[in-house]
């Protein structure tokens, strides 16, 4: 077996070795989102391009129905960037009596769904107040970190407002993961 | 060959194994940019430190003339941060009739050049409107993702305005890539 | 030894191979910070959760007293996100005669301490002016890059103002590293 190296008169066993080229990997890129219903109090999930242009999945890492499917347990580096764009005419539009104004905001969450768990797990969140006076605005939120995942886990990217996502270029909004 | 493990009486062949320590890797750090002419409608490319301080290239990953040269086909994680700084006294300087003001902006692009392709490929873009009233401002844009690259590909970092790049510290503005 | 593969009549020596699963790795998550004294002119270091929830350390990568301890020399990818939150009523509060207003700012630094060096080394810095008029604000700073580290090096995350760090969720503020 890989990881067993044989000498003429004895055998030594090591942790399994594997070729880097056969590890599960994916880089997904933005597509225009179709408005869809989503659960109240849950941010909508983005769907992605997985084959065209810069996008790919390989080595049993599959994409289906907004989810990346984890084919093998291990430690994965997971990342996403979402570029938002919008128009805000005032920072202090939402006045709330007795406390400071609640700012507009943009949020990205990378979420793990495990079928045996009732609740999704938020792995990464990037959240930012938006206060741009009198002009169009645009800005990215980038996230990336390492997590221990189990075979069968599913990953998705949720955003606070799907209508603000910049879907115009594959290099602006993307999502990926690879086994370390 | 690496990846072939020998037993006394037979040979088993596996996908190629390789030591992690001999994979192509680079981390480049900022140096002051000298003003140079660049093509109209193309963002200027940054040049980098590749040897001093925190910067290094190893295992045939070479840096030359603003480009990282990819020595071996495979999946690479590529990243960059550019810290920008500037002075802006108004967000809405550029008024355009009939639509909201066009904001000032800062943009970073990681670009791949393949000699057999006539056009460079934009791998990653971070772009942000800048609206800072009445003070000097500074902020980073961070990018990172995984891409399948071919031997001979070249990578560079382009910015919207080279005169706004903070070149004062190697930890503020950097560019790197490593074979997974 | 791993990396030495034996045939019946001769021995071939290769660069050492090792299983990916036994490489030093850590992902640390935010906990509420207790106010502590720190050296003047040095940003305070954050302390972290290393076992509960999404946090883990493995394969001799240990966390102690705000530091990640590097157990083995090699190239590491190091990352952190810190989410800040605060309240700013004016961008130009700090007026300074004879020059533009000094903006408020938020800064994250990933620092390496080597016992044989008198001074810590700043590996990564994310620094941003904050100018949010008349509202609460919140925003993340993300950093990540690859560095060559030595056994015994220690890593920490320093911030400009510990009281502005959002410690409310493990997905908002985190710190990690893994051997490549």
């Amino acid at each position: 077996l890989k990881g067993q190296e044989f000498a003429p008169s004895h055998q030594q066993v090591y942790a399994p070795l594997r070729a880097d080229g056969d590890k599960p990997r994916a880089h997904l890129t933005v597509v225009r989102q179709t408005p869809t219903q989503h659960f109240k109090n849950q941010f909508p999930a983005l769907h992605w391009e997985h084959e065209l242009g810069l996008a790919f999945t390989k080595n049993r890492m599959n994409y289906t129905n907004k989810f990346l499917l984890i084919p093998e347990s291990g430690d994965y580096f997971i990342y996403s960037q979402v570029t938002f764009r919008g128009m805000t005419s005032e920072c202090s539009e939402i006045r709330q009596a007795g406390r400071p104004n609640k700012p507009d905001s943009i949020t990205v969450v990378i979420t793990k769904v495990t079928d045996s768990y009732p609740e999704p797990t938020q792995l990464l969140m990037g959240t930012k107040s938006v206060c741009e006076v009198g002009s169009n605005w645009f800005q990215p939120i980038y996230l990336g970190a390492m997590f221990s995942l189990q075979e069968g886990d599913k990953l998705m990217v949720n955003v606070s407002d799907i209508s603000l996502v910049d879907y115009t270029a594959e290099d602006k909004t993307f999502f990926g993961a690879f086994l370390l | 060959l690496k990846g072939q493990e020998f037993a006394p009486s037979h040979q088993q062949v596996y996908a190629p194994l390789r030591a992690d320590g001999d994979k192509p890797r680079a981390h480049l750090t900022v140096v002051r940019q000298t003003p140079t002419q660049h093509f109209k409608n193309q963002f200027p490319a940054l040049h980098w430190e590749h040897e001093l301080g925190l910067a290094f290239t190893k295992n045939r990953m070479n840096y030359t003339n603003k480009f990282l040269l990819i020595p071996e086909s495979g999946d690479y994680f590529i990243y960059s941060q550019v810290t920008f700084r500037g002075m802006t006294s108004e967000c809405s300087e550029i008024r355009q009739a009939g639509r909201p003001n066009k904001p000032d902006s800062i943009t970073v692009v990681i670009t791949k050049v393949t000699d057999s392709y006539p056009e460079p490929t934009q791998l990653l873009m971070g772009t942000k409107s800048v609206c800072e009233v009445g003070s000097n401002w500074f902020q980073p844009i961070y990018l990172g993702a995984m891409f399948s690259l071919q031997e001979g590909d070249k990578l560079m970092v382009n910015v919207s305005d080279i005169s706004l790049v903070d070149y004062t510290a190697e930890d503020k503005t950097f560019f790197g890539a490593f074979l997974l | 030894l791993k990396g030495q593969e034996f045939a019946p009549s001769h021995q071939q020596v290769y660069a050492p191979l090792r299983a990916d699963g036994d490489k030093p790795r850590a992902h640390l998550t935010v906990v509420r910070q207790t106010p502590t004294q720190h050296f003047k002119n040095q940003f305070p270091a954050l302390h972290w959760e290393h076992e509960l929830g999404l946090a883990f350390t493995k394969n001799r990568m240990n966390y102690t007293n705000k530091f990640l301890l590097i157990p083995e020399s090699g190239d590491y990818f190091i990352y952190s996100q810190v989410t800040f939150r605060g309240m700013t009523s004016e961008c130009s509060e700090i007026r300074q005669a004879g020059r533009p207003n000094k903006p408020d700012s938020i800064t994250v630094v990933i620092t390496k301490v080597t016992d044989s060096y008198p001074e810590p080394t700043q590996l990564l810095m994310g620094t941003k002016s904050v100018c949010e008029v008349g509202s609460n604000w919140f925003q993340p700073i993300y950093l990540g890059a690859m560095f060559s580290l030595q056994e015994g090096d220690k890593l920490m995350v320093n911030v400009s103002d510990i009281s502005l760090v959002d410690y409310t969720a493990e997905d908002k503020t985190f710190f990690g590293a893994f051997l490549l």
Partner: antibody, heavy 117, light 107 residues
Framework: ELQLQESGPGLVKPSETLSLTCAVS????????WAWIRQPPGKGLEWIGD???????NYNPSLKSRVTVSIDTSKNQFSLKLSSVTAADTAVYFC???????????WGQGTLVTVSS | DIQLTQSPGTLSLSPGERATLSCRAS??????LAWYQQKPGQAPRLLIY???KRATGIPDRFSGSGSGTDFTLTISRLEPEDFAVYYC?????????FGQGTKVEIK
């Protein structure tokens, strides 16, 4: 408050070396490049060169063979030396902060140096 | 070296009038152009950078425009303190160079 203050002799003999110092206060010295610019009486501005806290310099090629800009970070000051001066080097010499890059957003008040025997 | 040519050499106007100053580069400098104001016996003061971005604290009656080789500084309504010499500076190529200046004087 950021202040830049040039100092040095106001009169230099032809063929000698002009030496000026600029003292900086009120700002982090290491965050910027620091420049020298000159202006002959009644004429326009000419960039001489600049330096950062690590001692990295950029010079105007027209003056490069005669110019040395140096820095003393312990004193928060930087200096200009211009060798083999002639009457054509008579000018007001300004030190300035370069921010964000290649733009001079804050200047000293200038010092007149006359080259004459 | 890139040469910058400013015109006119002198502009005679009254307070309240509009001033339009021109700067032409010998080759393209993109938008890497700055404008400075200098009064007698004083150091220059940065007004505009990036061809059109006002520096901190500069009144909005000052505006810059242009790209490539042709640039304009406009003072929409001259105030008494605006009478001075104005210089353009390019930073699109090394060495950095300045124009010869335009004097705005009271008519």
């Amino acid at each position: 408050e950021l202040q830049l203050q040039e100092s040095g002799p106001g009169l230099v003999k032809p063929s000698e070396t002009l030496s000026l110092t600029c003292a900086v206060s009120g700002v982090s010295f290491s965050d910027y490049h620091w420049a020298w610019i000159r202006q002959p009486p009644g004429k326009g501005l000419e960039w001489i060169g600049d330096i950062n806290h690590r001692g990295h310099t950029n010079y105007n090629p027209s003056l490069k063979s005669r110019v040395t800009v140096s820095i003393d970070t312990s004193k928060n000051q930087f200096s200009l030396k211009l060798s083999s001066v002639t009457a054509a080097d008579t000018a007001v010499y300004f030190c300035a902060r370069d921010f964000p890059n290649f733009i001079f957003d804050f200047w000293g008040q200038g010092t007149l140096v006359t080259v004459s025997s | 070296d890139i040469q910058l040519t400013q015109s006119p050499g002198t502009l005679s106007l009254s307070p309240g009038e509009r001033a339009t100053l021109s700067c032409r580069a010998s080759q393209s400098v993109s938008t890497y152009l700055a404008w400075y104001q200098q009064k007698p016996g004083q150091a220059p003061r940065l007004l505009i950078y990036g061809a059109s971005k006002r520096a901190t604290g500069i009144p909005d009656r000052f505006s810059g425009s242009g790209s490539g080789t042709d640039f304009t500084l406009t003072i929409s309504r001259l105030e008494p303190e605006d009478f001075a010499v104005y210089y353009c500076q390019q930073y699109g190529d090394s060495p950095l160079t300045f124009g010869q200046g335009t004097k705005v004087e009271i008519k």
